[in-house]
Interface confidence: low
């Protein structure tokens, strides 16, 4: 339904608080380098304008689209060219090209300082002094570092952030109360950002059809009792929500997400028996809860799939009449029977089924041709099963840190051209699959592991896209969304790589390493490991292990020394010489 004033419509639907928060997120995700104060000023101006439109929808400019209003406002930033360079050229364009231009300039790895957590008392004082500014600053700092963060979900994180400070700043032991909560929010936030980044990449790089296929599979696993028509409706609505958020239309996205949550709760009897608790919660918690809800139980006595999709004489007729609907039904039926499969595996099976029908429905005897299609699924199912089994065994044997190191070596040998920080970040995240998924029983391992790996490999893809250095990465990232993981798994050592020149500076360490947290120290050691492999790609596991063990002993020894800096200088030279000898550098 058309509204005279889109901005008034959204302001009334969302309320002032959410409206302001979402506009701040939108602006910070577009202009990631702008100071906080500048964004607050722009948001206040937009809010005041929105209020005039609520009072009189016919007032001047109130009929303009949100893209026009927001784009005009962003283009008033005085330092646009000097801060953002060619992004300033976007302002010379008309809508919708201007918004597309802003979207293309979103930076997944902005050059921003690491967020350092102040002392608890300092944070509590800031929270009590000006709660509103404190929470706005949280939204701003997260949004500018994660330009694709799912905006309505960020409102939920901000609500939990506020609750943590409200509770803990009056606790007897503020730090013991607050720090675990902040750690949890940080880790969940990073995971949420990465999951949303994959949804946006899916929509932007592979199109709506790819996203809808993913959604059919996932929602069918989650709501196996729901009818196909119901799942299709949810998929259509969910696709709209994510298309809007990924496109920077955050007000529409949040509004439509609220409508979808309302619909799901009003129709939960025909969707899932697991939604009752979620639907009793307030809006932000409700939407989050629905998104994370456990799979409902599968209906009893589901008939064999073969009857409708292999044995029926109408397979080719049904396929020809409505290809995507028929394939959607296949995916729905297969997914609701297989909560034990990853979504990407289900999509590979659907793709194999589609390819077979394309070929066989044009053959002389179609049925004879596709009769054995389900046999083609067996190797596709076994490949991730075997891979997960092997890697979980390795994880159980090594523990998380050493498992990450094994992956660091494996991936550096596959794609040594990729920057060291990216290899460290991605391999550390790949390694977390062990603690995240290997604890699960067999039936939950594959959906946990392979769908998580899809999220992590997408991080590699988006970071690599910014500065492409490896044809192999480009190939695995762009050829097929669902085959990214098998593509990377299949890569062997890159024999074309010319080893990096040895640089002693890379392996020079100082006493500051002693004061780092365990995590930061691990990253330092893992950075050195990647550099070692880049210098000596043919080094054996044993050689690398020996050098890393020596390195760990060296750090431990010097951190216990009275004169730490001298120890690092003198023992460091010896370590470099010994490592060069051990690796034949």
């Amino acid at each position: 339904d058309a509204h005279k004033s889109e901005v008034a419509h959204r302001f009334k639907d969302l309320g002032e608080e959410n409206f302001k928060a979402l506009v701040l997120i939108a602006f910070a995700q577009y202009l990631q380098q702008c100071p906080f104060e500048d964004h607050v000023k722009l948001v206040n101006e937009v809010t005041e304008f929105a209020k005039t439109c609520v009072a009189d929808e016919s007032a001047e400019n109130c009929d303009k689209s949100l893209h026009t209003l927001f784009g005009d406002k962003l283009c008033t930033v005085a330092t646009l060219r000097e801060t953002y360079g060619e992004m300033a050229d976007c302002c010379a364009k008309q809508e919708p090209e201007r918004n597309e231009c802003f979207l293309q300039h979103k930076d997944d790895n902005p050059n921003l300082p690491r967020l350092v957590r102040p002392e608890v008392d300092v944070m509590c004082t800031a929270f009590h002094d000006n709660e509103e500014t404190f929470l706005k600053k949280y939204l701003y700092e997260i949004a500018r570092r994660h330009p694709y963060f799912y905006a309505p979900e960020l409102l939920f994180f901000a609500k939990r952030y506020k609750a943590a400070f409200t509770e803990c700043c009056q606790a007897a032991d503020k730090a013991a109360c607050l720090l675990p909560k902040l750690d949890e929010l940080r880790d969940e936030g990073k995971a949420s950002s990465a999951k949303q980044r994959l949804k946006c990449a899916s929509l932007q790089k592979f199109g709506e059809r790819a996203f809808k296929a993913w959604a059919v599979a996932r929602l069918s696993q989650r709501f196996p009792k729901a009818e196909f028509a119901e799942v299709s409706k949810l998929v259509t609505d969910l696709t709209k929500v994510h298309t809007e958020c990924c496109h920077g239309d955050l007000l529409e996205c949040a509004d439509d997400r609220a409508d979808l949550a309302k619909y799901i709760c009003e129709n939960q009897d025909s969707i899932s028996s697991k939604l009752k608790e979620c639907c009793e919660k307030p809006l932000l918690e409700k939407s989050h809860c629905i998104a994370e809800v456990e799979n409902d139980e599968m209906p009893a006595d589901l008939p064999s799939l073969a009857a409708d999709f292999v044995e029926s004489k109408d397979v080719c007729k049904n396929y020809a009449e409505a290809k995507d609907v028929f394939l959607g039904m296949f995916l729905y039926e297969y997914a609701r029977r297989h909560p034990d499969y990853s979504v990407v595996l289900l999509l590979r099976l659907a793709k194999t089924y589609e390819t077979t029908l394309e070929k066989c429905c044009a053959a002389a005897d179609p049925h004879e041709c596709y009769a054995k299609v389900f046999d083609e699924f067996k190797p596709l199912v076994e490949e991730p099963q075997n891979l997960i089994k092997q890697n979980c065994e390795l994880f159980e044997q090594l523990g998380e840190y050493k498992f990450q190191n094994a992956l660091l070596v494996r991936y550096t040998k596959k794609v040594p051209q990729v920057s060291t920080p990216t290899l460290v970040e991605v391999s550390r995240n790949l390694g977390k699959v062990g603690s995240k998924c290997c604890k699960h029983p067999e039936a939950k391992r594959m959906p946990c592991a392979e769908d998580y790996l899809s999220v992590v490999l997408n991080q590699l893809c988006v970071l690599h896209e910014k500065t492409p250095v490896s044809d192999r990465v480009t190939k695995c990232c762009t050829e097929s969304l669902v085959n990214r993981r098998p593509c990377f798994s299949a890569l062997e050592v890159d024999e074309t790589y010319v080893p990096k020149e040895f640089n002693a500076e890379t392996f020079t360490f100082h006493a500051d390493i002693c004061t780092l947290s365990e995590k930061e120290r691990q990253i330092k050691k893992q950075t050195a490991l990647v550099e070692l492999v880049k210098h000596k790609p043919k080094a054996t596991k044993e050689q690398l292990k020996a050098v890393m063990d020596d390195f760990a002993a060296f750090v431990e020894k010097c951190c216990k020394a009275d004169d730490k800096e001298t120890c690092f200088a003198e023992e460091g030279k010896k370590l470099v010489a010994a490592s060069q000898a051990a690796l034949g550098l």
Partner: nanobody, 115 residues
């Protein structure tokens, strides 16, 4: 399936001691930090103490500092909480949790401090 089973609770006089144990199964115990959480009657869960995966880094709530000691035996897949100088306000159900969560995934063990 992840399982955490606490034991060692009971009735003790003020100033007395107890040692709680938490036997873990179904996950790689040695790869996870662990915590103790308690819930007094009519109150929300309260974080008590945490220990990292290797057992070297420990943290305590202010209310129990100097009286309670957290430890672990990765070979036995067991987490411990040694509680000395117990006070009536330590009365609660004690749970062990993975990480530093205050969400309870187990039955807990009742500790009652009363004369």
């Amino acid at each position: 399936e992840v399982q955490l089973v606490e034991s060692g609770g009971g009735l003790v006089q003020p100033g007395g001691s107890l040692r709680l144990s938490c036997a873990a199964s179904g996950f790689t115990f040695g790869s996870f930090g662990m915590s103790w959480v308690r819930q007094a009657p009519g109150k929300g869960p309260e974080w008590v103490s945490a220990i990292d995966s290797g057992g070297t880094d420990t943290r305590y709530a202010e209310s129990i500092k100097g009286r309670f000691t957290i430890s672990r035996d990765n070979a036995k897949k067991t987490l411990y909480l040694q509680m000395n100088s117990l006070k009536p306000e330590d009365t609660a159900v004690y749970y062990c949790t993975i990480g530093q969560s205050t969400s309870r995934g187990s039955q807990g063990t009742q500790v009652t401090v009363s004369s």
